[in-house]
Amino acid sequence: ALITQQDLAPQQRAAPQQKRSSPSEGLCPPGHHISEDGRDCISCKYGQDYSTHWNDLLFCLRCTRCDSGEVELSPCTTTRNTVCQCEEGTFREEDSPEMCRKCRTGCPRGMVKVGDCTPWSDIECVHKE
């Protein structure tokens, strides 16, 4: 699957503590970005930014911060973004991924519950036979 747009981290210049190495075939490994002149690979800052693939990004990508109403499943590393999940009792729909919504507490009259509330889906109700 193809990767979609994300914000660049606002680091214009490599801080002295950032490790440097040489690009391979003009690309830098996951956890790094490339310098403006293309001569160096500069490490991303742990917990602040990351890159997931071999790349020639001029800046690493800013780590996601979990919203209130979300729990952090795994922290941001230099090679992987934060993984956030909706808190228990709430879910995130594919068509509105920006927020967690409360799961319904029960099914309408004449329907029966066949699926529980999960972080990615509301309860599932079907008509009684």
């Epitope: 699957a1 193809l2 990767i3 979609t4 747009q5 994300q6 660049l8 690009p23 391979s24 075939e25 003009g26 690309l27 490994p29 490339i34 002149d37 293309g38 997931t52 693939h53 071999w54 790349n55 020639d56 990004l57 001029l58 800046f59 990508l61």
Partner: nanobody, 126 residues
């Protein structure tokens, strides 16, 4: 924020030419390489071509080699793709992309990108 804006798409006859443009606003392209992908309904985006803005090195998918030419104008922050000898199978939405992402450094074909334009439709009829 990196913003990529494509233009130049349209409807042409087989054998005709078109030139697509990709202009970057904001923090320029955010990467050294800039590329083009294309997508037809129901299929994944496929890589078409890329260029290194520093030294002009180019990369092409086999399906367009010899027909499409990618170039850049760094002063205008723009990348172009000249498409010649167009075929009906070139019909697609064409996307400009930056921050190309690869599984291995030796790979010539990116698996995706961080930044995408909104796409421009190219229709080639026979």
């Amino acid at each position: 924020e990196v913003q990529l804006v494509e233009s130049g798409g349209g409807s042409v006859q087989a054998g005709d030419s078109l030139r697509l443009s990709c202009a970057a606003s904001g923090r320029t392209f955010g990467s050294i390489r800039v590329g083009w992908f294309r997508q037809t309904p129901g299929k994944e985006r496929e890589f078409v071509a890329a260029i290194n803005r520093n030294d002009g090195t180019t990369y092409y998918a086999d399906s367009v080699k010899g027909r499409f030419t990618i170039s850049r104008d760094n002063a205008k922050n723009t990348v172009y793709m000249q498409m010649a000898s167009l075929k009906p199978e070139d019909t697609a939405v064409y996307y400009c992309a930056a921050g190309l992402q690869y599984n291995r450094s030796a790979d010539r074909v990116p698996v995706g990108a961080v930044y995408w334009g909104q796409g421009t439709q190219v229709t080639v009829s026979s």
